[in-house]
């Protein structure tokens, strides 16, 4: 997260760290007792490593009573996701068992109404991704409020040049932005999960390259079918 600040500890009980061999790789969001939603591209970086999900964390390194690492029973990337595109960049991870819920671990309601968020709406994005262009990684969860950007502006030739589909949304990226390591994390508007940070090699913090988020409402049928 660029241009943000440390999040209130354990105030985002839905927040997950998707880890490979014990190292944070991507963000994720608990959407059901046994399911975490993340980005499909995160699996590409996992290679053959052991994928696990950390819930109830604020600090990645320090012991915390609410922290627990879960093995992954099943990884379900969206069937249409591809390595060479950010389209359909969603991944559902089934935990080895139902998460133990409490004040620091709780699923987040996700948007089911397939309607664009109004431009200018301030949405919260959080993660353990890099906090500087130098690549400094935080130990504690960071967050930033970002205004939603209208799709027409985001699709300008000077911005993402038509790459943003109806199934994606954009947020401003003028110094404040999500970045490497935040992929798969939640974009929360009005207390509801609206988007998932797409994974890609996008430059961060540049206003001409807005943050791209996969709209969860556009994938409600797929999410429901996997969770069923």
């Amino acid at each position: 997260i660029l241009g943000g600040r440390e999040a209130e500890a354990h105030a985002r009980p839905y927040m997950a760290s998707v880890q490979v061999n014990g190292e944070h790789l991507c963000g994720g969001v608990l959407v059901a007792e046994q399911w975490v939603l993340s980005a499909a591209h995160c699996l590409e970086d996992a290679a053959d490593g052991k994928v696990q999900v950390l819930l109830g964390a604020h600090s990645l390194s320090q012991p915390e009573p609410s922290k627990r690492l879960y093995d992954v029973l099943r990884a379900v990337p969206h069937p249409d996701s591809r390595p060479d595109t950010i389209d359909h960049d969603l991944l559902l991870l089934q935990l080895s068992e139902k998460a133990t819920l409490g004040p620091a671990v709780r699923p987040l309601p996700w948007q089911r109404v397939d309607r664009d968020v109004e431009p200018g709406t301030l949405c919260d994005v959080a993660g353990w991704g890099i906090v500087s262009h130098a690549g400094r990684r935080p130990d504690r969860l960071q967050h930033v409020l970002l205004p939603v950007l209208d799709r027409a502006t985001c699709n300008r030739r000077t911005h993402h040049d038509g790459a943003i589909t109806q199934r994606m949304m954009c947020a401003e990226s003028n110094r404040r932005d999500s970045c490497k390591g935040d992929s798969g994390g939640p974009l929360v508007c009005g207390g509801v999960l609206e988007g998932v940070v797409t994974s890609g090699s996008r430059v961060c913090g540049n206003r001409k390259k807005p943050g791209i988020y996969t709209r969860v409402a556009s994938y409600a049928a797929w999410i429901d079918s996997v969770l069923a």
Partner: antibody
Amino acid sequence: EVQLQQSGPELVKPGASVKISCKASGYSFTGYYMHWVKQSHGNILDWIGYIDPDNGVSSKNQKFTGKATVTADKSSSTAYMELRSLTSEDSAVYYCAGYYGSSWYWYFDVWGTGTTVTVSS
Amino acid sequence: QIVLSQSPAILSASPGEKVTMTCRASSSVSYMHWYQQKPGSSPKPWIYATSNLASGVPARFSGSGSGTSYSLTISRVEAEDAATYYCQQWSSNPYTFGGGTKLEIK
């Protein structure tokens, strides 16, 4: 302690413009959005818009398009709102407000002292 | 935009009474905030994210609701509660307020 100190009352003529200020103290001015809210005489609260003092990114209620412009000066930790082409409908108390927490929700947890604008010939 | 309608506009209660005021949204929102305002003062945050009391708010206040219907309840009204209470949604731009409920103490 976060404080938002607003400029004093303004008596302005119809058709004129006015610029009111909101000086912030007790926190990093560039770290948080500054919002503006209008309270008209029927005590109706209307959100006008916000600005991110760090980068100038702003958003406005369409209702105030052509009426209000919000700006911020980082060097003085002060936010401004200019109201133009004033009419009696613009007579109101104007507040700056912000959220200075770090949770997933946001609300106006700090409000300015308010600036009364009276439009009269 | 989301329109918030508060009722009643004026509420009159005796000390010790239980009172409830409501806020209805024209379309569904996930959470609601409430503010208290007394004459000549700026609004104060009172209840945030539907049911959380802001700092310094007495425990006799509570908030609840979901979807399009939210409420603020005072279990036993006291004289100092006389004020106007506004609901506010933050789900969608433009952020809107209700018209307010003025609580008068008999």
